[in-house]
Amino acid sequence: HKSSSQGQDRHMIRMRQLIDIVDQLKNYVNDLVPEFLPAPEDVETNCEWSAFSCFQKAQLKSANTGNNERIINVSIKKLKRKPPSTNAGRRQKHRLTCPSCDSYEKKPPKEFLERFKSLLQKMIHQHLSSRTHGSEDS
């Protein structure tokens, strides 16, 4: 169905944008509070959205040092913004078998961001591999 695939595309383009925000934050990793955060890795199939929400819930914080505080806080806020809802996301919400956020290994900000980026890339890969050839236009 064309409109639902366009909605999915728009949703994945948002994921694509999140990767750039993660990359931006990686530049300021020394200005983040060096706290250990749950960082899902090797996420099992159908638990991607659950893992995604774990990354969004994590308390990534600026160390409030230097003049990078504003860009860091804006970037973190954008990472936490709720993405548009999709059927895939709704379906996965009903899976009770996905690990809880606390069960994931905790990592410092650098590895946390790297793992977040890997998950986003995996989700985009799954989306692009499952759709027919054609444009990402909306």
């Epitope: 595309d9 994945m12 383009i13 694509r16 944008q17 954008k78 890339q121 990402e136 236009d137 909306s138």
Partner: antibody
Framework: QVQLVQSGAEVKKPGASVKVSCKAS????????MHWVRQAPGQGLEWMGT????????IYSQNFKGRVTMTRDTSTSTVYMELSSLRSEDTAVYYC?????????WGQGTLVTVSS | DIQLTQSPSSLSASVGDRVTITCRAS??????LNWYQQKPGKAVKLLIY???RLHSGVPSRFSGSGSGTDYTLTISSLQPEDFATYYC?????????FGGGTKVEIK
Amino acid sequence: QVQLVQSGAEVKKPGASVKVSCKASGYTFTDYWMHWVRQAPGQGLEWMGTIDPSDQYTIYSQNFKGRVTMTRDTSTSTVYMELSSLRSEDTAVYYCARYGFAMDYWGQGTLVTVSS
Amino acid sequence: DIQLTQSPSSLSASVGDRVTITCRASQDISNFLNWYQQKPGKAVKLLIYYTSRLHSGVPSRFSGSGSGTDYTLTISSLQPEDFATYYCQQGHTLPRTFGGGTKVEIK
């Protein structure tokens, strides 16, 4: 259909600033980030940075940080790229490009010539 | 920054020829590789995104393949309108970077 229409050619003196505009149409302006890329005469393409038109969030290339400012006007679906402290090496064609999964639509380019 | 090395930098070919352009990244870019076409005085056009996905309106004679660090753009049967410069670009990591370009000229 998606269209990106850029402002006309500019001639500037070294040390001056230039502001290039890029008017978008044919899609929801705030759904897609806009990137800026430049091309010096006879050279390849160089990425300058990107702006999220929904909230004016920007990411700039280290090569231009401190000299480039990207802004937007949602009422006219236009993004702007301002480059300051111009030098002769900034002579180039400047492109805006919409970013979906890639830079899927590009403006026609704006030639900026820096000459004393 | 991720470096992209395109080869060849230029090539001469005839209409109907099969043309292959390669792009090598300095690190694994996980298929986040796009191809563009540029003609003098014209807007740049996206041909292929995410290694092998054909952008809308792009003829099927264009195809892309690759993984890891090595990627290829193939034009199965070169047409007169295909004489242009082609660029690869990685979308894996900021900053966005482009290959040096490959100019396809008429033999």
